[in-house]
Amino acid sequence: DADMKGHFDPAKCRYALGMQDRTIPDSDISASSSWSDSTAARHSRLESSDGDGAWCPAGSVFPKEEEYLQVDLQRLHLVALVGTQGRHAGGLGKEFSRSYRLRYSRDGRRWMGWKDRWGQEVISGNEDPEGVVLKDLGPPMVARLVRFYPRADRVMSVCLRVELYGCLWRDGLLSYTAPVGQTMYLSEAVYLNDSTYDGHTVGGLQYGGLGQLADGVVGLDDFRKSQELRVWPGYDYVGWSNHSFSSGYVEMEFEFDRLRAFQAMQVHCNNMHTLGARLPGGVECRFRRGPAMAWEGEPMRHNLGGNLGDPRARAVSVPLGGRVARFLQCRFLFAGPWLLFSEISFISDVVNNSSPALGGTFPPAPWWPPGPPPTNFSSLELEPRGQQPVAKAEGSPTA
């Protein structure tokens, strides 16, 4: 079955997250500084005319670019789109930001700079104080906190109103650790690296982040082709060569937001065996409840049979037997020269009364609405009442 059952669709993950409609409270909007109380962070809501009509920082954003507006979404969200405006103030305002950068954090500790698929960090902003400019984030970011850093090319006043669009990140995946993806040499080089990974890379291992294996984009049957425009061959897949792994397997670790009962893992794999890509021969996963704890019980083993001759890409479902954990370590066994994955997702239920893993003393927030529903594998928030998702620009996945 090539279908990723319950798999979230990033194209539908485009709901306004609450700046304009005030479901994000003032207390969750802050800033590095404000010019005055009438241009404080709470006045940064899109289409709002509160105060003097926008957030304006006290300091100059040129040349340092250190001033920021911060929005705390309180829970992990997939943020797919942002919108910006300047300070209109009934026609009296003239301040806006022609460009800006974004930084985001899943936990209030480590901040990552958003970059597009080609490594560009600077986002084109507004050309006037009133117009709303929407920016499709390709890749989207999984974040709890988002910071907007307005830019300027000279000393000048800049002001900002914003909205974020996306959906709740129900999967609960905080990070995965994996070996760095490799390059396959055919008639042309096929780059099977995780090009949007936002963690660290040390000694051939990527850790502490999320990337293409959790971005909702499922690869095509021909791994040399892509869903994305203007990208390199192999873009949708992360791949590893059997020659580089004497153990005969690729090992990955997955970290989740809280204790969960895992029903299954779904791995979208390529099986273009004429070019060396094969489904894994089997998967073995082990489980633990905390970062410094021992792995618990026997590993879950799953052998993969089925129609390995069919060259189409497909989702492989690995049963996990309801095992309770916050950390999973899985070994994917080679059954051919290459393993190529485009997406890994989990069907899990939050274990009742397990508190969020984001420890410390951050201001408390409910991790779920009252009476948390099981995740049932969907990372997509149920459609907010009376809201429609923002449509995607036609023919341009990353416009």
Epitope: S30, G108, V202, G203, G208, P291, A357, G359
Partner: antibody
């Protein structure tokens, strides 16, 4: 720069708050940590104030210390000091884009807990 | 809880010699390791970060190596000014759920 203040002689159980004052950089962009060193002993990490407002503590320090911040200071409150808390207390800044090491330290402030 | 075990507690070497200090973490810390030098009456000074990187101004005589749970600081061509106590510091951090930091017990380096 970073400078600690507030160190003094206090009796066990008495409340004590140390202040770390920073200049030349903004606490809205940098994370700050508290570290202590008992006389003739090694360094002990106490906790960290993230620029987002989040606070983490060493497991041994939870409940014994409280960290808070303003726009230019990071405070460390020793909730109910004992003689074991006698030490020099350092405030240290983390790297701008790397949260795993301390690249700027204050000179320290000495706290003596004695009856 | 992260525990950093540093050895030896003390080491003596001659000027021009080499000293090796080891640090073992109780958990895999993925090169999130720093080394500091501290002299009496002074705060620690950063020597190495990310297990092997030198901040500007630190001589290349100081070399950090290691990965996973095992790390080493090597000081070559010892100078009298290198007499100090050296500490390793590790961080355990996942993708957003847990942060812990700890120092090793320190190594006193005596230069003859």
């Amino acid at each position: 720069s970073v400078e600690e203040s507030g160190g003094r002689l206090v009796t066990p159980g008495g409340s004590l708050t140390l202040t770390c004052t920073v200049s030349g950089f903004s606490l809205s962009s940098y994370d700050m940590s508290w570290v202590r060193q008992a006389p003739g002993k090694g360094l002990e990490w106490i906790g960290i104030s993230w620029n987002s407002g989040f606070v983490d503590y060493a497991s041994w320090a939870k409940g014994r210390f409280s960290i808070s911040k303003t726009s230019t200071t990071v405070d460390l409150k020793i909730t109910s000091p004992t003689t074991e808390d006698t030490a020099t207390y350092f405030c240290a800044r983390l790297g701008a884009d790397d949260i795993y090491y301390f690249n700027l330290w204050g000179p320290g402030t000495l706290v003596t807990i004695s009856s | 809880e992260l525990v950093m075990t540093q050895t030896p507690a003390s080491v003596e070497a001659a000027v021009g010699g080499t000293v090796t200090i080891k640090c073992q973490a109780s958990e895999t810390i993925s090169s999130r390791l720093a080394w500091y030098q501290q002299k009496p009456g002074q705060p620690p000074k950063l020597l190495i970060y990310q297990a092997s990187k030198l901040p500007s101004g630190v001589p290349s005589r100081f070399k950090g190596t290691g990965s996973g749970t095992e790390y080493t600081l090597t000081i070559s061509d010892l100078e009298c000014a290198d007499a100090a106590t050296y500490y390793c510091q590790g961080c355990y951090y996942g993708g957003g759920s847990f942060y812990d930091s700890a120092f090793g017990g320190g190594t006193e380096v005596v230069v003859k």
